[in-house]
Interface confidence: low
């Protein structure tokens, strides 16, 4: 299963498969996801090491049993792949490291304004990795405003110094926020030229290209079919790079095809894994279990719950098979990959879906870093759980906030359905920034049945909580997933790092904006809370936030909508926003449906619904 | 010209332990498999260990797994099978193989082999 | 695992003469399937890989074919130097099973 899990003060011994400098354990967590071999992690920042080459070393680790023996080490950060997470899995990291410099091989240096432009020109180039920036307070003036765009064999740096005013952070391409578009386009009976990055054996050009997209250096391949010439080389798959960034020439080659990577799409990437079974086909690797199933999608399915296991093969042999159960081959390799194809088989092959993002409705969210008044704009994908809800009427006008919790569920506030409870005037839209963007053709979802928390009573504060079914499960992109509920009765976290969104009104006499806002607000005290709101019962099942001086807070328009706080790289949903006395007012916090008190309410109803719950809280 | 040399056999006592080197040259060794295969005195070809290119993945046979242990040093182009617990049906020529392109399963090039004898 | 059968166990034959051996998989492996020649107190050779492709060298007399679980070497019309025990190999699954051997001795 899922485990989210950080060990502090903890370094997993022995079973390393890879190591490389990460500038945080998050960072280090996402590479051992995409990993083929890697189940377990182990991080070393700068202040738990005096060994200079060891500062920044994230160890990648392989374990037959899934666990090794933990050590004590302080300051080390430990933790699990999050293979098997389904959404949670993203190659994004939007992170800024601040007095850390990214060391690789320097391409491109140019002046810009801010480390924010650097990072867009980083993501806008198509050989930049990472880049680091050097502010207007840099030591040295002539590298003050310098923009350093870089790349390495792997993808990581090569090394990673601590150094003052200077910033650094990763290409968000792969959170597919990059300018330069892709070539969807597959050329059959063509061959690249330039430089072999990698190898690999894939069934076909899609999975080839799915490998391409995902490899650090690969931007465009060819691949070779099972009818190629040259037998040794059928169903290998090339991923190449070139100085330029495309080939330099191409061949026409029978029974070759050739392609770019999706890396650069702008809106949507591939997903991270391979869903397509090939019938007639065995995959060859070492062998990890034998195990009889009936049919080959409950053997891809047993593939995909064994962690460890990347391929399989359904046998259809009559001596493997007993009644109507026959055997599924559950197999791994160095790379991932198969390492022999053998086609005219009476087996049927395929591969593990670990690394889906829809992956199982259950798990919550870690991966992603409010009008609110006194906000900032926020950015594409920075709070995918978002959504609008918007009633059509003779007009159509954005009411509430709401957050995604699962593929068919949202979680809002019960007051928005005050004089409006009816389903078919609602349309709620996600995987949206701008208000502005959204027209007749807009996808939106509908509801299928609102379920207002039974003890909610209109124009009082308490049980502010409602769920939304949707008519149709949403898929999972890196600008629509889900955001993770909290534990039940959470009351020993604290969160230090909350975040209110929504496009409600910036002041109180104001208007609904454009560009989603998002405010940073520091949790109150539920007895400072009281105090402030003399007139109201505060209680247990609401939190509160704001600053005692005002000037940040959700205002009207941003109702339903998320309070969500990062704690431990994992960001959950603490609190619905629901009321306020105004907006931002001094001494005047803002009043939230408390998430974890409703956790029973929210579990009962997703399961009743329809049988089978649909998200739940981390472990 | 492709060559492997062995070296490191001999004889040893049951419960022993054995470190059998394989020097490589003529080709780029980080980039293939290497293979250990054994053959028992008038048997057949018995596969015993291989390794990939980085170091990072191995495997063995049933009949060695926990005993012995592959390993490599790219930067001298060697190939090591570390050998304890060793009983009287490891008594073989050991030899070592580069393994095909792409880590392939073919044995293109095998050394001449060095003679592991177990016994009291 | 794989089991890989060679028939026969041993061969006699002259010189000249025209030499099947057989080699059967327990399952189906496609073309993963190479035969070695290995003389008397030497080490072993590859002659063919992939079922069918002969090694650089190796002479045209001797040719492989089949798919799936059967596969035969042929030798066309042998040689002194023919005289050898040979071995196939399965490398489709990572466990390398190698047949039984197949002795070729002058008659």
């Known amino acids: 299963g899922c485990l989210t899990q950080l060990y502090e003060n903890a370094f997993f011994r022995g079973g390393d498969v890879a190591s490389m400098y990460t500038p945080n354990a998050q960072y280090c967590q996402m590479r051992c996801t995409f990993h083929p071999r890697c189940l377990l992690f182990s991080f070393l920042p700068a202040s738990s090491i005096n060994d200079m080459e060891k500062r920044f070393g994230c160890f990648l680790k392989d374990s037959v049993t899934g666990t090794l023996p933990k050590v004590h080490r302080t300051g080390a950060v430990s933790g699990h792949s999050l293979k098997q997470c389904g959404h949670q899995i993203s190659a994004c990291h939007r992170d800024i490291y601040k007095g850390v410099d990214m060391r690789g091989v320097n391409f491109n240096v140019s002046k810009v304004s801010s480390v924010e432009e650097c990072q867009k020109r980083c993501t806008s180039n198509i050989r930049c990795q990472f880049f680091s920036y050097a502010t207007q307070t840099f030591h040295k003036a002539e590298y003050r405003n310098n923009c350093l765009l870089k790349y390495s064999p792997g993808g990581t740096p090569t090394a990673i110094k601590v150094l003052s005013n200077v910033e650094s952070g990763f290409s968000l391409k792969p959170c597919a926020l990059s300018e330069i578009g892709c070539h969807m386009n597959i050329f059959q009976h063509l061959a690249f030229s330039d430089v072999d990055v990698a190898r690999v054996l894939t069934p076909d050009a899609f999975v080839c290209r799915t490998i391409c997209t995902y490899h650090p250096n690969c931007l465009f391949f060819t691949f070779y079919t099972n009818v190629w010439k040259i037998e040794s080389q059928r169903n290998v798959c090339l991923l190449k790079t070139s100085e330029s960034g495309t080939p330099s020439s191409s061949t026409p080659q029978e029974n070759t095809i050739s392609g770019y990577s999706l890396l650069t799409c702008k809106r949507t990437l591939p997903e991270p894994c391979h869903s397509k079974i090939y019938p007639g086909v065995d995959f060859g690797g070492e062998e990890l279990n034998v195990t009889f199933v009936k049919g080959v999608n409950v053997c891809q399915e047993t593939c995909t719950k064994m962690i460890r296991c990347q391929f399989f093969t359904y046998s259809l042999l009559p001596e493997d098979c007993k009644e109507e159960k026959c055997k599924c081959f559950l197999r791994l390799s160095m790379d991932g990959s198969p390492t022999r194809i053998a086609y005219g088989t009476q087996g049927s092959s395929g591969y593990s879906l670990r690394l889906c993002n829809t992956g199982d409705n259950s798990v919550c969210t870690t991966k992603t870093s409010t009008r609110i008044v006194g906000g900032t704009n926020s950015s594409w994908g920075e709070w995918p759980w978002q959504v609008s809800l918007q009633v059509k009427l003779t007009a159509q006008r954005h009411l509430c906030g709401g957050s995604l919790i699962g593929h068919q569920w949202v979680l809002t506030a019960a007051h928005c359905f005050d004089g409006l409870p009816l389903q078919d005037v609602w349309r709620i839209y996600s995987g949206i920034l701008n208000l502005s963007d959204i027209t007749k053709d807009t996808p939106f979802s509908q509801i299928k049945e609102i379920i207002i928390h039974q003890n909610y009573k209109v124009s009082e504060g308490n049980h502010d909580i409602a769920l939304i079914k949707l008519q149709a499960p949403l898929n999972y992109t890196e600008f629509q997933k889900p955001i993770c509920l909290p534990s039940k009765g959470d009351t020993s976290t604290i969160y230090t790092n909350c975040w209110v969104t929504g496009w409600g009104f910036s002041k109180e006499k104001g208007e609904i904006q454009n560009i989603l806002q998002k405010v940073n607000i520091p949790l109150v005290t539920n007895e400072e809370c009281q105090k402030r709101y003399q007139d109201y019962k505060i209680t247990q099942r609401m939190v509160c936030a704001g600053y005692k001086e005002g000037g940040k807070d959700a205002c009207k328009g941003d109702s339903g909508g998320p309070l969500v706080c990062k704690h431990n790289g994992m960001w959950r949903l603490v609190g619905i926003t629901s009321w306020g006395e105004g907006c931002a007012r001094r001494e005047q916090p803002g009043v939230y449906t408390k998430v974890a008190e409703y956790m029973d309410w929210i579990l009962e109803k997703t399961q009743s619904s329809d049988g089978k719950a649909q998200m739940q809280s981390p472990a | 010209e492709v060559q492997l040399l062995e070296s490191g056999g001999g004889l040893v006592q049951p419960g022993g332990s054995l470190r059998l080197s394989c020097a490589a040259s003529g080709f780029t060794f980080s980039q293939y498999a290497m293979h250990w295969v054994r053959q028992a005195p008038g048997k057949g070809l018995e596969w015993v260990s291989s390794?990939?290119?980085?170091?990072?993945?191995?495997l063995y046979a049933d009949s060695v797994k926990g005993r012995f242990t592959i390993s490599r040093d790219n930067s001298k182009n060697t190939l090591y099978l570390q050998m304890n617990s060793l009983r009287a049906e490891d008594t073989a020529m050991y030899y070592c193989?580069?393994?095909?392109?792409?880590?392939?399963?073919?044995?293109?090039?095998w050394g001449q082999g060095t003679l592991v004898t177990v016994s009291s | 695992d794989i089991q890989m059968t060679q028939s026969p166990s041993s061969l006699s034959a002259s010189i000249g003469d025209r030499v099947t051996i057989s080699c059967r998989a327990s399952?189906?492996?496609?073309?993963?399937l190479n035969w070695y020649q290995q003389h008397a107190g030497k080490a072993p050779k590859l002659l063919i890989r992939?079922?069918?492709s002969l090694e650089t060298g190796v002479p045209p007399r001797f040719s492989g074919s089949g798919s799936g679980t059967d596969f035969t070497l042929t030798i066309s019309s042998l040689q002194s130097d023919d005289f050898a025990t040979y071995y196939c190999?399965?490398?489709?699954?990572?466990?390398?099973?190698f047949g039984q051997g197949t002795k070729l001795e002058i008659k």
């Open positions: 190999q399965e490398s489709f699954t990572n466990v390398y099973n």
């Open positions: 399952r189906g492996i496609g073309t993963y």
């Open positions: 992939a079922a069918s």
């Open positions: 193989a580069r393994g095909g392109w792409l880590a392939g399963g073919e044995l293109l090039n």
């Open positions: 390794i990939y290119p980085s170091g990072g993945f191995t």
